[in-house]
Each structure stands twice: as structure tokens, then as C-alpha cells.
């Protein structure tokens, strides 16, 4: 039985020429992780692998940074950046977990929550600051 | 360089409460994995506790779940161990030691610092 | 919980010779998905904190001498020296990190004749 959840930025709206981190947390699981995907829509942009460490996608490897930790950190950021991002963790004996982060990048100088880059940890003031809980797949 | 130093150990009674600290320097603190690990009096090595590059997750074995609490404070680079409702058994030289993200082996590990549970 | 025993608990070879030691998991500590083996080698000296030898079961840590080399699969390991210098008296634990909580082998002494 799968336990563990995913909590990810959640909904995040960024400047365009700006960057942003895009992160997940896996939780409630001693499942180990083995590798997490990042994808933009059908896209794959980085893998950071158990036994190789992160691989950024060649069409990516301008704007997209690995980290900090497991999560991805999106550069030069363009109108187009805008949509679904996931977070695949692949574990053990778990299977796969998915987390999802929408982005939407804007043209105007004022970025709803911008600075919001890392998972919410403390108190939070109102629903829309909660972490997205994931869901969980088997493999 | 790498370095863990650990401090906080001594005697305790059974039933007493001590803190670990371990500073780290020499690498990206936040950016790694960090566990205790306790080395018994027979030489025995166990692992105690665990805690994720942001604090996020923390993970115990049954001996200890309960009693000991592993947190972590990125800004100071610095990594804890509270333990409380300590028994003879607990009585060891516990180490820090670093652990690279989706690795679980420990790579670097500090001097140690020991604790003495008895009356 | 995995136990993993470690053999011979010690043993005393002569320098330049070739030492074999064993660690056995109680379950595989191979995953289907990558192919690894979840096995780390340590060496703690007297009055040393441990040190990381090998990962991956066969993987050498960098800065580790060629002479120490890790191999098995499943849960069968092996740590071998090819030729055992003076500085290499320690203790060797295998650890599986395969599935929480980890463990560790009681270790085995290696002295120098």
C-alpha cells in the first residue's frame, strides 16, 4: 500500500526574464527514492538519478539549473514557460509518486507570488498557501 | 575540506535528556542528507536517526522512535540530536555523518562525541 | 530488519598478502529497477571515526587505494585486499541501505601479523 504523499509549491506565478524553483516532497514513506523526473507537460527536462546524479535535457540546458536539493530551478523565464510541471519520484518498494506545479509566467512586473520559491513549512494564512498534495501511482 | 564535529556528549542518568550538535563546514550543508550514527561499547555500529536535505523528512529505527528527535538548522549549518528518556543502552560515541541525496551510504562522517548513560 | 553478518569476525594476515572478507545480507539487497546493489564498505582505524571504502557494492570511494575491491550480489559481498599494507589494520563494516531502518555488520578485525 502506497502511503506517502507528495506537497509541491503548489500554483506559482513568476516574471518573465525571472527565474523560479519548482520543488516537491515526498513524505510519509520509508519507501527509498531511487531517481525523480522533472517534465513540463510531455516534456522531460531533468532526471537526478541514485547512481548517476542529474542529467539536464539538452533542449534545457541553457535556462534549467539543477537544486537546490531535488528540485529544479527554471531561468530566463519566457511566456511559453507557462503550464503543468510534474515530479515523478520512481521508489521502492512504493512504485512511482506524481506532484504537480502549475507556472504561469507573466509580463507584468508585479508576480503574484514570486517569491514564493520553497515549500510552505510554517502556519499558513489561507488555502491557497497550502502545499499541493500529489498522488501516488503504482510501477 | 569536509568536516562534521560533533559536541553535546557526557554522562547523563537514566531517564535524562541531552543535545547533540554537530557543525558542519567545508561543503553545502543544505544541500545533503544527514543521519546519526552510534557506535556501542562492543563496537557495534547502528543507525539513529535521519533527516532530509531540508528538514522535511525524519526517519528512525524502533529502538529510539519517540525518544530521540533529529532537526537541523541550514542557516548555522548545523545539525542536532535531542535525546531524552535515555537508558543504558544508548550509552555510545555518536557520529554525524553526511549523505549525498538519493544515496543513503555515509560519506563522510565526524570524530564523534560520547555519551555515558548510568547512575 | 536486514541483518547482515560479516565473517571472520577477525584475522590476522602478513603484510603484501591477499584478504578476503564476507558480508551477508538476510534479504537482496539488489534493486530490479537500477540493477544496484545497496551495499557501502567502511574502514575504521583505531581511534578513527569510520571512513567510506566502497558504495554501490563495487564502486570505489575517490581517494580509495585500488588494492580495496568490492564485489557480490544479491546477498552475497565480498571486501578483498590484493595486497595488505601495514597502514590498512582497521575494522571493516559492511551496511545495507536497501530499506530502512539500516544496518550494519558486527565488522571484521583485520590485524597485521
Known amino acids: 500500500m502506497m502511503t506517502g504523499t507528495i506537497e509541491t509549491t503548489g500554483n506559482i506565478s513568476a516574471e518573465k526574464g525571472g527565474s523560479i524553483i519548482l520543488q516537491c516532497h515526498l513524505s510519509s514513506t520509508t519507501a527509498q527514492v531511487t531517481q525523480v523526473n522533472w517534465e513540463q507537460q510531455d516534456q522531460l527536462l531533468a532526471i537526478c538519478n541514485a547512481d548517476l546524479g542529474w542529467h539536464i535535457s539538452p533542449s534545457f540546458k541553457d535556462r534549467v539549473a539543477p537544486g537546490p536539493g531535488l528540485g529544479l530551478t527554471l531561468q530566463s523565464l519566457t511566456v511559453n514557460d507557462t503550464g503543468e510541471y510534474f515530479c515523478i519520484y520512481h521508489t521502492y518498494p512504493d512504485g512511482t509518486y506524481t506532484g504537480r506545479i502549475f507556472l504561469e509566467v507573466l509580463e507584468s512586473s508585479v508576480a503574484e507570488h514570486g517569491a514564493r520559491f520553497q515549500i510552505p513549512t510554517g502556519d499558513y494564512k489561507d488555502d491557497d498557501d497550502k502545499p499541493n498534495k500529489g498522488s501516488g501511482t503504482t510501477s | 575540506e569536509v568536516q562534521l564535529v560533533e559536541s553535546g556528549g557526557g554522562l547523563v542518568k537514566p531517564g535524562g535528556s541531552l543535545k547533540l550538535s554537530c557543525a558542519a563546514s567545508?561543503?553545502?550543508?543544505?544541500?545533503?542528507?544527514m543521519s546519526w550514527v552510534r557506535q556501542t561499547p562492543e563496537k557495534r555500529l547502528e543507525w539513529v536517526a535521519y533527516i532530509s536535505d531540508g528538514g522535511y523528512n525524519t526517519y528512525y529505527p524502533d529502538t529510539v522512535k519517540g525518544r530521540f528527535t533529529i532537526s537541523r538548522d541550514n542557516a548555522k549549518n548545523t545539525l542536532y540530536l535531542q535525546m531524552s528518556s535515555l537508558k543504558s543502552e544508548d550509552t555510545a560515541i555518536y557520529y554525524c555523518?553526511?549523505?549525498?541525496?538519493?544515496?543513503?551510504?555515509?560519506?563522510?562522517w565526524g570524530q564523534g562525541t560520547t555519551l555515558t548513560v548510568s547512575s | 530488519d536486514i541483518v547482515m553478518s560479516q565473517s571472520p569476525s577477525s584475522l590476522a594476515v602478513s603484510v603484501g598478502e591477499k584478504v578476503t572478507m564476507t558480508c551477508k545480507s538476510s534479504q537482496s539487497l539488489l534493486y530490479s529497477s537500477n540493477q544496484k546493489n545497496y551495499l557501502a564498505w567502511y574502514q575504521q582505524k583505531p581511534g578513527q571515526s569510520p571512513k567510506l571504502l566502497i558504495y554501490?557494492?563495487?564502486t570505489r570511494e575517490s581517494g580509495v587505494p585500488d588494492r580495496f575491491t568490492g564485489s557480490g550480489s544479491g546477498t552475497d559481498f565480498t571486501l578483498t585486499i590484493s595486497s595488505v599494507k601495514a597502514e590498512d589494520l582497521a575494522v571493516y563494516y559492511c551496511?545495507?541501505?536497501?530499506?530502512?531502518?539500516?544496518?550494519f555488520g558486527g565488522g571484521t578485525k583485520l590485524e597485521i601479523k
Open positions: 554501490w557494492a563495487s
Open positions: 555523518a553526511r549523505q549525498i541525496l538519493l544515496r543513503y551510504y555515509f560519506d563522510y
Open positions: 551496511q545495507q541501505y536497501h530499506s530502512y531502518p539500516w544496518t
Open positions: 567545508g561543503f553545502a550543508f543544505s544541500d545533503y542528507d
